[in-house]
């Protein structure tokens, strides 16, 4: 049998049949079903949803659907001892307290088990002291405070606005600055788009709304108590003092009504410049402490949350491949939510559900994919990507040998303006070709392709006539697959217009107001953007699982490697004297990139010409493509980040959400002018150039003719 016969119908027809089966109305129905009650990780409600999804995936026609459980460290507020922040007077009396929870949205007044806003994994504590406003609490904000303004955060409680970077990085920065507590708040400048009403009349954040979220610095470790290994029945667990990534100071989030009360009394230094001012009617003074009349008043935090080892459940569905059952294409997204999960994650979970249903329909008609497709509903993503990471740790040997690709499926929308894609360069051509075949859902682009509207609205900064595709960072379930295991990965969703909406994420992110109605009324009433995202995600999975030759183009990796090498070289060249003094050369890296480019080009030529009817040669070429991403993995990992092993990409050390290229070199160069031992610092730069050059060269050689 030829590989086409094995899959029963011709590939073109299959893809069309698969895409035609996807229905917006079904996605809408699934979203409604998944968002009526909270599905917090570790709760009975989320276990019940896991069982429901398992049952429905079986009905849809998957070959098997299993629950994979793990016992991981989670964090919850104390039900009888709520968390709050107060302003206390000189007698210690609480003269102001922050709200204990958000006012519920219409129709949800009687819903139980809405977890109040909290910072997951905050230690307990009741610190009191003067307040310092630290802007976004980014690395550069603390540089500004400490180096330029000479403000010492040691022993202070800092208040930082959400946005720009992952909240865990903010907390880490505050800890390093010596703070004894952190208050996180949503400023209207970042979470209230002008001209839009607050929920329930629009998609903006009300003053009582608060963003929940974990504040870990796991660096890819998964369960804090079992780094590197699955949290199974016989796991050896670290003591809490040795747990990975836990914050050491109390942290709590608040809304802008409460933030106003804390910030309006601030004294001390004026904000250094306008970039430190938000949109509240307060001076945005940095502090420390309150102004004149209020100088004897302090801020006190009351945090009583507890960390508990709790059982979580992934749902893993399998659609066995007809020709290469030992090659896995994975579609995964999380199921757990902070509250209702109207966008995060259920807009993604509903899309996955419909993709599974469509694949199941084809399977019931006698079709099978060429390769095995695994579908995953991950648990405890919100608590540090725990479900996906534990499963990948448990199955790492299989995944590193058999994993072709991972497509992530968290929130399908964060806006309704245009497509947003982050992926490995290997998938660029797949994404381009697929979006050229899909219809754009955008107004004004009727009859045009998705590629066209996407390119018009989000053009590539480097290549005219092409859309922007971003680097993978982290903060989602692809992390372990890409950054640790080196499995080619990608993600797609509909996004906002970043030009006109400079707020961070979407305003109601991780709040109680992230409901079904938010999506149905304001973001996507016709569910046409959800359908488009289903087509992109599902289409990618379809092609990856069904194309005879894997739809990876190694030449695109060559292009970006050159770009990243140029970029890191230009950063280093800001220190020409030191480069000369310490004999720092990038020649080896540029040479390796040149070799990669040439070898990739030759490989691509061979890929056009080889005999695709020879299953051994076909498998050999496909394996070279599959293992290319794997070749960028350094088994030793990055310095102090052993689970970030990809040499070309890692989450930024200053913002987990962002991807950094040549991260080892980048981190070695970062703030190098302030290092106490420049010789040692530049020695590390040289070592990192060596590691990068070696890795690129070694990866290139995997594409050479095998003999």
């Amino acid at each position: 049998k030829s590989s086409n016969e094995a899959t029963n119908i011709t590939p073109k027809h299959n893809m069309k049949a698969f895409l035609d089966e996807l229905k917006a109305e079904n996605i809408k129905k699934f979203l409604y079903n998944f968002t009526q009650i909270p599905h917090l990780a570790g709760t009975e409600q989320n276990f019940q949803l896991a069982k429901q999804i398992q049952s429905q995936w079986k009905e849809f026609g998957l070959d098997s659907v299993e629950l994979a459980h793990y016992d991981v460290l989670l964090s919850y507020p104390n039900k009888t001892h709520p968390n709050y922040i107060s302003i206390i007077n000189e007698d210690g009396n609480e003269i102001f307290n922050t709200s204990l929870f958000e006012p519920p949205p219409p129709g949800y007044e009687n819903v139980s088990d809405i977890v109040p806003p909290f910072s997951a994994f905050s230690p307990q504590g009741m610190p009191e002291g003067d307040l310092v406003y630290v802007n976004y609490a980014r690395t550069e904000d603390f540089f500004k405070l400490e180096r330029d303004m000479k403000i010492n955060c040691s022993g202070k409680i800092v208040i930082a606005r959400y946005g720009k970077v992952f909240r865990g990085n903010k907390v880490k920065n505050a800890q390093l600055a010596g703070a004894k507590g952190v208050i996180l708040y949503s400023d209207p400048a970042d979470y209230f788009a002008p001209g839009v009403k607050s929920y329930p009349d629009g998609w903006n954040l009300p003053g009582g709304g608060v963003q929940r979220g974990n504040i870990l610095n796991l660096n890819g470790a998964g369960d804090p108590l079992t780094p590197g290994y699955p949290a199974n029945e016989y796991a050896y667990r670290r003591g809490i003092a040795e747990a990975v990534g836990l914050p050491s100071i109390p942290v709590h989030p608040i809304g802008y009504y409460d933030a106003q009360k804390l910030l309006e009394k601030m004294g001390g230094s004026a904000p250094p410049d306008s970039s430190w001012r938000g949109s509240l009617k307060v001076p945005y003074n940095v502090g420390p402490g309150f102004t004149g009349n209020f100088s004897t008043q302090k801020v006190k935090m009351h945090i009583h949350s507890t960390n508990e080892v709790t059982r979580i459940y992934n749902v893993i569905g399998t659609l066995r491949g007809a020709v290469e059952p030992d090659r896995y294409v994975i579609l995964g997204g999380h199921r757990d939510s902070w509250v209702f999960g109207g966008i995060d994650p259920q807009s993604g979970a509903a899309v996955v559900h419909e993709i599974v249903r469509s694949f199941g329909t084809l399977k019931k008609e006698g079709w099978r994919p060429r390769r095995t497709i695994l579908f995953a509903s991950w648990d405890a993503e919100e608590f540090g990507l725990l479900g996906s990471t534990e499963w990948a740790e448990e199955n790492s040997r299989l995944l590193q040998e058999r994993g072709v690709a991972y497509i992530n499926a968290d929130s399908s929308i964060e806006g309704n303006y245009t497509l947003r894609v982050d992926c490995t360069p290997l998938m660029y051509s797949l994404v381009h070709n697929l979006t050229k075949e899909l219809k754009s859902p955008d107004e004004g682009f009727e009859g045009k392709s998705l590629y066209e509207s996407w390119t018009k609205k989000s053009p590539s900064p480097e290549f005219s006539g092409m859309p922007r595709i971003s680097k993978l960072g982290s903060g989602n379930d692809f992390e372990v697959f890409f950054q640790r295991l080196g499995i080619a990965s990608g993600r797609a969703r509909y996004t906002k217009n970043w030009e006109t909406n400079k707020f961070s994420g979407y305003p109601l992110y991780h709040s109680v107001y992230e409901t079904y109605e938010l999506v149905e009324k304001f973001y996507d009433p016709m569910f046409k953007y959800h359908l488009t995202v289903a087509q992109v995600r599902g289409g990618m999975v379809f092609e990856l699982a069904n194309s005879i030759v894997l739809p990876f183009d190694c030449r695109d990796y060559a292009v970006v490697l050159r770009k990243y090498a140029d970029k890191i070289y230009s950063i280093s060249m800001k220190h020409p004297q030191e480069m000369k003094t310490y004999s720092v050369s990038f020649d080896s890296l540029f040479s390796a990139v040149k070799n990669f480019t040439e070898i990739a080009s030759k490989f691509s030529e061979r890929l056009q010409d080889f005999d695709k009817s020879n299953p051994i040669v076909l498998r050999m070429m496909n394996d070279q493509l599959m293992f290319l991403e794997r070749a960028f993995i350094d088994p030793l990992g990055l310095p102090d980040r052993p689970f970030y092993r990809h040499v070309i990409y890692a989450p930024s050390s200053h913002n987990k959400y962002a991807g950094e290229s040549f991260p080892g070199i980048y981190d070695a160069l970062f703030d190098i002018e302030s290092k106490v031992d420049p010789s040692k610092a530049w020695g590390e730069v040289k070592r990192q150039i060596y590691v990068a050059a070696f890795t690129v060269q070694a990866a290139a050689e995997t594409l050479s003719e095998v003999a």
């Epitope: 003269i95 102001f96 307290n97 709200s99 204990l100 929870f101 958000e102 006012p103 519920p104 219409p106 007044e109 009403k197 607050s198 929920y199 329930p200 009349d201 009300p206 003053g207 009582g208 009504y257 009360k261």
Partner: antibody
Framework: EVKLVESEGGLVQPGSSMKLSCTAS????????MAWVRQVPEKGLEWVAN????????YYLDSLKSRFIISRDNAKNILYLQMSSLKSEDTATYYC?????????????WGTGTTVTVSS | QIVLTQSPAIMSASPGEKVTISCSAS?????MYWYQQKPGSSPKPWIY???NLASGVPARFSGSGSGTSYSLTISSMEAEDAATYYC?????????FGAGTKLELK
């Protein structure tokens, strides 16, 4: 000057209907939720209904939902309360109020009130 | 619905005396509002979002609390403060008021 002025109330028979209106001035009417709050003589305040900015969403005290309708005309800056099947227990002073915090009601401006007496 | 219980129902205070009026909610609420009403007048907004004084309210007034327990405090009673004070919850529909506390001048 920010002002809310209710229409004249009056004496009506049980079972009959009455429509109250409230004219707003001194602010952009369409930028605010509006509400009706009533007060039985010598008793406390009771929220009756709220309406959102454009009138697309309305919220009522459950016991009044089937008999009272809140509406607004943003072009004319008028808030209405249509009351039907009136009962003696609906006798009260009815206040029109501006809601500063949107859906989550905080009434920062009140009318002077209009008295409705339901009696045979 | 959330029931608000004010205490005391009636109280009297001498000029200069500290006054505290309590408002207890049947279940936790996010914020509390307070209104002042004098005979023959419509209610006036007095304290919003638990602790913010409405425009024109003297600084001797303050509000505090969280969860189910809230209070309005007058640090030093004055004659013009004699009135009825109502609390109102900002949490969920139906919006509810307390029965009122009538504060008289002793």
């Amino acid at each position: 000057e920010v002002k809310l002025v209710e229409s004249e109330g009056g004496l009506v028979q049980p079972g009959s209907s009455m429509k109250l209106s409230c004219t707003a001035s001194g602010f952009t009417f369409s930028d605010y939720y509006m509400a009706w709050v009533r007060q039985v003589p010598e008793k406390g305040l009771e929220w009756v209904a709220n309406i959102n900015y454009d009138g697309s969403s309305t919220y009522y005290l459950d016991s009044l939902k089937s008999r009272f309708i809140i509406s607004r005309d943003n072009a004319k800056n008028i808030l209405y309360l249509q009351m039907s099947s009136l009962k003696s227990e609906d006798t009260a002073t009815y206040y029109c109020a501006r809601d500063l915090d949107g859906y989550y009601g905080y009434f920062d401006v009140w009318g002077t009130g209009t008295t409705v007496t339901v009696s045979s | 619905q959330i029931v608000l219980t004010q205490s005391p129902a009636i109280m009297s205070a001498s000029p200069g005396e500290k006054v505290t009026i309590s408002c207890s909610a049947s279940s936790s609420v996010s914020y509390m509002y307070w209104y002042q009403q004098k005979p023959g007048s419509s209610p006036k907004p007095w304290i919003y979002r638990t602790s913010n004084l409405a425009s024109g309210v003297p600084a001797r007034f303050s509000g505090s609390g969280s969860g189910t327990s809230y209070s309005l405090t007058i640090s030093s009673m004055e004659a013009e403060d004699a009135a009825t004070y109502y609390c109102q919850q900002y949490h969920s529909y139906p919006l509810t008021f307390g029965a009122g506390t009538k504060l008289e001048l002793k």
